[in-house]
Amino acid sequence: EINGSANYEMFIFHNGGVQILCKYPDIVQQFKMQLLKGGQILCDLTKTKGSGNTVSIKSLKFCHSQLSNNSVSFFLYNLDHSHANYYFCNLSIFDPPPFKVTLTGGYLHIYESQLCCQLK
């Protein structure tokens, strides 16, 4: 397991919510991405491929998410001070093999200015 701080801007604030950006390498074809708050799984997204290269996207812990070819964004809304914590992107790479897990994260600071325009 590889651990580290995200070397990119992980938190993007907008309208009283936050987009948490979890990046993965372009070469990765099949994976599971989990968003952890402290040690708790908040969200997950799993991408797998079928025999004809069809794609399946599944979530056991569903959050509003957005998938691109090198990132998964998880969206948290209605921010309040209780959201302040360490957040981690827990990436399990299935394909290409061998199986590998990487953990990157950062601390989400909540400031009054980010609470002003909450989405309902």
Epitope: G50, S51, T54, K58, F94, F99
Partner: antibody, heavy 121, light 106 residues
Framework: EVQLVESGGGLVKPAGSLTLSCVAS????????MHWVRQAPGKGLEWVAV??????????YYSDLVKGRFTVSRDDSQGMVYLQMNNLRKEDTATYYC????????????WGQGTMVTVSS | DIQMTQSPSSLPASLGDRVTINCQAS??????LSWYQQKPGKAPKLLIY???LLADGVPSRFSGSGSGRDYSFTISSLESEDIGSYYC????????FGPGTKLEIK
């Protein structure tokens, strides 16, 4: 212990039909893509068909040589996979293997011992 | 469909020899290539997947390499139990096997 056991092979006349069965045990069958691979006597291996898992809506794919004549299906509750073969030709004579593959999270590949199909008048 | 070619079709070798089998795909298969060993009357056995990763329990004398369209399989020192037929298989899109290589004692 992982086991794949094929059955249903035998002698059939050209243009006839046959259904092969394969029963799986010892692994989580519903997570695996199930393939049929055949081998004519003294020849090499030839992929025939695959049926994907429920996550992929049980999608099926066939080699050009059998498309329109063969149908693969599965029953996850029984751990069974089937190959319905219609309009059989002499060149379909082969040992038919049932195989199970998975790539997530690790790559595994299991094979049965095969069942012989002979197409002859 | 992706086509696979394999060479040589027959490979006489002596015990202890280093032997190499080549496989070529009709298009780039992005390392989605496996190698199988088959002994007479038996089902094939997976040796290598994703070009160079050894399947569980496979001895380290077996290895694989390659990229794009071109791949190879090597036995560093041939043992008597290695005699049989070897097949490459692409799994980039569905499955296709190479025609096979029969490895025999010289």
């Amino acid at each position: 212990e992982v086991q794949l056991v094929e059955s249903g092979g035998g002698l059939v006349k050209p243009a006839g039909s046959l259904t092969l069965s394969c029963v799986a045990s010892g692994f989580t069958f519903s997570d695996y893509f199930m393939h049929w691979v055949r081998q004519a006597p003294g020849k090499g291996l030839e992929w025939v068909a695959v049926i994907d898992t429920k996550s992929f809506n049980y999608a099926t794919y066939y080699s050009d040589l059998v498309k329109g004549r063969f149908t693969v299906s599965r029953d996850d509750s029984q751990g069974m996979v089937y190959l319905q073969m219609n309009n059989l030709r002499k060149e379909d004579t082969a040992t038919y293997y049932c195989t199970a593959t998975i790539a997530v999270p690790y790559y595994f590949d299991y094979w049965g011992q095969g069942t012989m199909v002979t197409v002859s008048s | 469909d992706i086509q696979m070619t394999q060479s040589p079709s027959s490979l006489p070798a002596s015990l202890g020899d280093r032997v190499t089998i080549n496989c070529q795909a009709s298009q780039d298969i992005s390392n989605y290539l496996s190698w199988y060993q088959q002994k007479p009357g038996k089902a094939p056995k997976l040796l290598i997947y994703y070009t160079n990763l050894l399947a569980d329990g496979v001895p380290s004398r077996f290895s694989g390499s390659g990229s794009g369209r071109d791949y190879s399989f090597t036995i560093s020192s041939l043992e008597s139990e290695d005699i049989g037929s070897y097949y490459c298989q692409q799994y980039y899109n569905y499955r296709t096997f190479g025609p096979g290589t029969k490895l025999e004692i010289k």
